[in-house]
Interface confidence: medium
Amino acid sequence: AFGISGVQKYTRALHDSSITGISPITEYLASLSTYNDQSITFALEDESYEIYVEDLKKDEKKDKVLLSYYESQHPSNESGDGVDGKMLMVTLSPTKDFWLHANNKEHSVELHKCEKPLPDQAFFVLHNMHSNCVSFECKTDPGVFIGVKDNHLALIKVDSSENLCTENILFKLSET
């Protein structure tokens, strides 16, 4: 499921460093929806893409996102054996050459056209949450997650135990 030995050897040597420029371990094409089953959709408007969170009509086709998985080290300044804190990171691309980016200054999630190697703002730590959901934590800003705010994706800071399991940062991935 995820793992190509050559890539593993490459990523295993990394510790507290960028993973950009490295080939993904595996890729997965899926539709992205919220905990409450609203779909994440992408629309081209005035030569740029907008991201929406909306209820689809019954037979409306869901937009797909290509998730590219990478394995990296949990950034750490602790003493260790160099393999402590392996984690999965993902990039999310709804269409060729465009990736979701975290804009930490504006607390927004945007679609940017860019070439590889991708910037760190395009990488999100994947958390395997309860109820078959996932959450996406910014690589560049630990504790900040992709979430839903006013029918748009936004960056939401999770700084207390009440916040994290709130539904607005939980997402479902589906092949259909």
Partner: antibody, heavy 122, light 111 residues
Framework: EVQLVESGGGLVQPGGSLRLSCATS????????MNWVRQAPGKGLEWVGF??????????EYSASVKGRFTISRDNSKSILYLQMNSLRAEDTAVYYC?????????????WGQGTLVTVSS | EIVLTQSPATLSLSPGERATLSCRAS??????????MNWYQQKPGQAPRLLIY???NQGSGIPARFSGSGSGTDFTLTISSLEPEDFAVYYC?????????FGGGTKVEIK
């Protein structure tokens, strides 16, 4: 270096209680889900439960066989994991291990303690 | 809960031979492109040792002779050429969902 050291095992009568400890070092304790896994003598491995990390509110999950009788807790100031076992039964006799995943709750465990033996017998 | 069935229960082989261990899940352990199936080795009196995680990834410091494959419900652990230290019990474990579950184990013994 990541270290996990269990203690607190021993002989206890059916219906009795026992508290196991898992002292940890070498990592930021609050960042990690922490698990208990047990193994009855000559038998296979059984997951007991886990306690989530700080960002997930330190909430817990248990296997059906121990739910309502066992409680997992943690002392984050001391980096110690606990397993409080009440209403013990003969079938709870096992070596109890604490285990830590690489990160988050992906659920695979490269780090294990040496185990502590709990014997429930009259 | 997801039930894992390992086969065979016992595998009698000689050093240098190839070992193929099977684990079958009662339902798929795949989720968002990852197979949440893991393999451990355990020797008497020792804690389990993670060999393979997410179906095919080697744990840290695990020799290259150990490999994992499979997806969905059927998984295989292969030891390409058995070394004397490989004779032990091997467990599969799913971590797709709580409760995490383990297979009953396969004992690899010297023929």
């Amino acid at each position: 270096e990541v270290q996990l050291v269990e203690s607190g095992g021993g002989l206890v009568q059916p219906g009795g209680s026992l508290r196991l400890s898992c002292a940890t070092s070498g990592f930021t304790f609050t960042d990690y889900y922490m698990n208990w896994v047990r193994q009855a003598p000559g038998k296979g491995l059984e997951w007991v439960g886990f306690i989530r990390n700080k960002v997930n509110g330190y909430t817990t999950e248990y296997s059906a066989s121990v739910k309502g009788r066992f409680t997992i807790s943690r002392d984050n100031s001391k980096s110690i994991l606990y397993l409080q076992m009440n209403s013990l039964r003969a079938e709870d006799t096992a070596v109890y291990y604490c285990a830590r995943p690489y990160y988050g709750n992906y659920g695979w465990f490269p780090y294990w303690g040496q185990g502590t033996l709990v014997t429930v017998s009259s | 809960e997801i039930v894992l069935t390992q086969s065979p229960a016992t595998l009698s082989l000689s050093p240098g031979e190839r070992a193929t261990l099977s684990c079958r899940a009662s339902e798929s352990v795949d989720n968002y492109g990852i197979s949440f199936m893991n393999w451990y080795q355990q020797k008497p009196g020792q804690a389990p040792r993670l060999l393979i995680y997410a179906a095919s990834n080697q744990g840290s410091g695990i020799p290259a002779r150990f490999s994992g494959s499979g997806s969905g419900t059927d998984f295989t652990l292969t030891i390409s050429s058995l070394e004397p230290e490989d004779f032990a019990v091997y467990y599969c474990q799913q971590s797709k969902e709580v409760p995490y579950t383990f297979g009953g184990g396969t004992k690899v013994e010297i023929k």
